[in-house]
Amino acid sequence: QKSSIEKCSVDIQQSRNKTTERPGLLNCPIYWQQLREKCLLFSHTVNPWNNSLADCSTKESSLLLIRDKDELIHTQNLIRDKAILFWIGLNFSLSEKNWKWINGSFLNSNDLEIRGDAKENSCISISQTSVYSEYCSTEIRWICQKELTPVRNKVYPDS
């Protein structure tokens, strides 16, 4: 049986050798809203899809990427007015005849129920309740995202 001092010393040594996950971006920047492991910025101005894409880049972010239906619902819950549409990072690839995320991956057909046509010059917008295909030239608001990316840090607690 170890004494309490010995036990404390062992605990400290184990802590020194332990690596823990810590987000590189601990808090979302001002005006950005945290949604799980992301920071979201809802624009207050309007733009066509291409300009929205460029604006997010200037903010060192990207147009919103949605992983699944659950993330979609949580994002939609942040939209206050049901008459407003927001561009996200998904558009129609004519060459591949499929919806393509701006990170190069294709849409899993089960993820989003898109209302509207899948055709050239179509981009995806979301409202409080729905997901719409609209002409990419349409001037609406948009959502940028920054990932709260985990960074591996060694932790050395004070002994």
């Epitope: 309007v46 407003i84 898109i114 209302r115 509207g116 719409y132 609209e134 349409t138 001037e139």
Partner: antibody, heavy 124, light 109 residues
Framework: EVQLVESGGGLVQPGGSLRLSCAAS????????MSWVRQAPGKGLEWVSA????????YYADSVKGRFTISRDNSKNTLYLQMNSLRAEDAAVYYC?????????????????WGQGTLVTVSS | QSVLTQPPSVSGAPGQRVTISCTGG?????????VHWYQQLPGTAPKLLIY???DRPSGVPDRFSGSKSGTSASLAITGLQAEDEADYYC?????????FGGGTQLTVL
């Protein structure tokens, strides 16, 4: 309370011109796309034209393209429809309508508020 | 000729249920575009009755309901009342612009 009041209708000869106005109140006019919809006597509704909230983008039905021009003055909360080279088939009640969605003419839009309409008669 | 087809007229007795159909094709309703419904009482401007296929604006009684399936949509009115006598129009989107159905005249017997 949202209100849309059209004016400018009247009798015009074929080939003539007319300018319709729609005075809007009760909402932030510059935020909404607006449309003109017409209804010939005893007939159904026909969408004519739409304009984005900023006025930068305009949209037209094929039947009026090149003859009609939609515009807006957000400082006056007023929507316009300039109609040139009028034909007998343009005779109708013209309604000004607010698009449901903000900012631009959306493919999925409906029209949530309508004016009372102004009658355009085209006859020689 | 409208790209959205509605029956020219329907009728029903007070208290009954009536439905009005709106049939489109693969370039409008079938392409996933929303369907909206309007009521036009005699001598008045149209009024939005149903938007986004099945949503009711505030103030519209729940006797009115909308649905959409495939290339068609329908408006149902239950508990028919004399004041429901009006023209009803469906609306959607096709090839770059808004389109309306030809309209249906509802007569309350």
């Amino acid at each position: 309370e949202v209100q849309l009041v059209e004016s400018g209708g009247g009798l015009v000869q074929p080939g003539g011109s007319l300018r319709l106005s729609c005075a809007a109140s009760g909402f932030t006019f510059s935020s909404y796309a607006m449309s003109w919809v017409r209804q010939a006597p005893g007939k159904g509704l026909e969408w004519v034209s739409a304009i984005s909230g900023s006025g930068r983008s305009t949209y037209y039905a094929d039947s009026v393209k090149g003859r009609f021009t939609i515009s807006r003055d957000n400082s006056k909360n007023t929507l316009y429809l300039q109609m040139n080279s009028l034909r007998a088939e343009d005779a109708a009640v013209y309604y000004c309508a607010r698009d449901y969605y903000l900012y631009d003419y959306i493919t999925q839009t409906s029209f949530d508020y309508w004016g009372q309409g102004t009658l355009v008669t085209v006859s020689s | 000729q409208s790209v959205l087809t509605q029956p020219p007229s329907v009728s029903g007795a007070p208290g009954q249920r009536v439905t009005i159909s709106c049939t489109g094709g693969s370039s409008n309703i079938g392409a996933g575009y929303d369907v909206h419904w309007y009521q036009q009482l005699p001598g008045t401007a149209p009024k939005l009755l149903i938007y986004g296929n099945s949503d009711r604006p505030s103030g519209v009684p729940d006797r009115f309901s909308g649905s959409k399936s495939g290339t068609s949509a329908s408006l149902a009115i239950t508990g028919l009342q004399a004041e429901d006598e009006a023209d009803y129009y469906c609306q959607s989107y096709d090839s770059g612009h808004t389109v309306f159905g030809g309209g249906t005249q509802l007569t309350v017997l």
